[in-house]
Amino acid sequence: GSERTCCPVNWVEHERSCYWFSRSGKAWADADNYCRLEDAHLVVVTSWEEQKFVQHHIGPVNTWMGLHDQNGPWKWVDGTDYETGFKNWRPEQPDDWYGHGLGGGEDCAHFTDDGRWNDDVCQRPYRWVCETELDKASQEPPLL
């Protein structure tokens, strides 16, 4: 593949990454798959500065990010280390709450209306943010 040197149409460039902000809501798995097919991943927040950038663009709306614990420990979708990385959970979160009555706990992380993070049922139809890094190899073959 070819290296991506600028962001696709309708994506926002910031600090050598490109971001796409959905305007509809989908389950976490749908959002995750959508980003993958767009040669990207659900947003991985690695700093306070990136947190503020994303928060500014999404506004006070529940929005999925690329963090989940569906297989046990919390994991970022791109392999970024969770334990040593940036975190911005709401107080008392994550709590893997079972009281929602939908079956199971809460395995997927989202931005809440104030930007801080909460774990929630992965089937909830929230908006989402895709991220892809500039200068990484694209899956798309180069145009001849």
Epitope: V9, N33, Y34, Q139
Partner: antibody, heavy 115, light 107 residues
Framework: EVQLQQSGPEVVKPGASVKMSCKTS????????MNWVKQGHGKSLEWIGR????????RYNQKFKGKATLTVDKSLSTAYMQLNSLTSEDSAVYYC????????WGQGTTLTVSS | DIVLTQSPATLSVTPGDRVSLSCRAS??????LHWYQQKSHESPRLLIK???QSISGIPSRFSGSGSGTDFTLTINSVETEDFGMYFC?????????FGAGTKLELK
């Protein structure tokens, strides 16, 4: 209720072109990829390509590049597929379907290419 | 392109049997694997998404499992209405691809 209503059967001569439609209702058209899938008689399913109605972006299976052209009319919530330079190999049932796992399907459009 | 290999090509069963249909991917596709049923002269119908997630309106006797390259669709107790073709499909990468199908028939 989500519905995908496809246009009727087509019988065309080799070398001709055809344009089939898929009228949708019951959901926000611009929120889902719209795909087209080919099924030859007694055969498996082949993904032709998809269009993203929100920005008209298209992706094609390499096998169908130059054969199929996918478009949408957002005002009508309708997806279209044009097939050109038709041969007997293009005789098949063509389905429109939604998203990237295909949760809703049209009833299919039967295309017969015959002289 | 990712190739999906389904086995067996044909499965002859009796109503009440528990059956397992296999779908193997040519490379790892995580859980981006979906299952469909198609009866004669009908459009396919989504049974399972993301390897194991159930679909509203689909009987609970249908279940899916697997991750990576090996996936299974299980029908806990086959009913007469279940006979037909079963296809798997991946959404890990373009082009989206289907398996060749497994035909479930009456023994």
């Amino acid at each position: 209720e989500v519905q995908l209503q496809q246009s009727g059967p087509e019988v065309v001569k080799p070398g001709a072109s055809v344009k089939m439609s898929c009228k949708t209702s019951g959901f926000t058209f611009t929120d889902y990829y719209m795909n087209w899938v080919k099924q030859g008689h007694g055969k498996s399913l082949e993904w032709i390509g998809r269009v993203n109605p929100s920005n008209d972006d298209t992706r094609y299976n390499q096998k169908f590049k130059g054969k199929a052209t996918l478009t949408v009319d957002k005002s009508l919530s309708t997806a279209y597929m044009q097939l050109n330079s038709l041969t007997s190999e293009d005789s098949a049932v063509y389905y429109c379907t939604r998203w990237f796992y295909f949760d809703y399907w049209g009833q299919g459009t039967t295309l017969t290419v015959s002289s | 392109d990712i190739v999906l290999t389904q086995s067996p090509a044909t499965l002859s069963v009796t109503p009440g049997d528990r059956v397992s249909l296999s779908c193997r991917a040519s490379q790892s596709i995580s859980n981006y694997l979906h299952w469909y049923q198609q009866k004669s002269h009908e459009s396919p119908r989504l049974l399972i998404k993301f390897a194991s997630q159930s679909i509203s309106g689909i009987p609970s006797r249908f279940s899916g499992s697997g991750s990576g390259t090996d996936f299974t669709l299980t029908i806990n107790s086959v009913e007469t209405e279940d006979f037909g073709m079963y296809f798997c499909q991946q959404s890990n990468s373009w082009p989206l691809t289907f398996g060749a199908g497994t035909k479930l028939e009456l023994k």
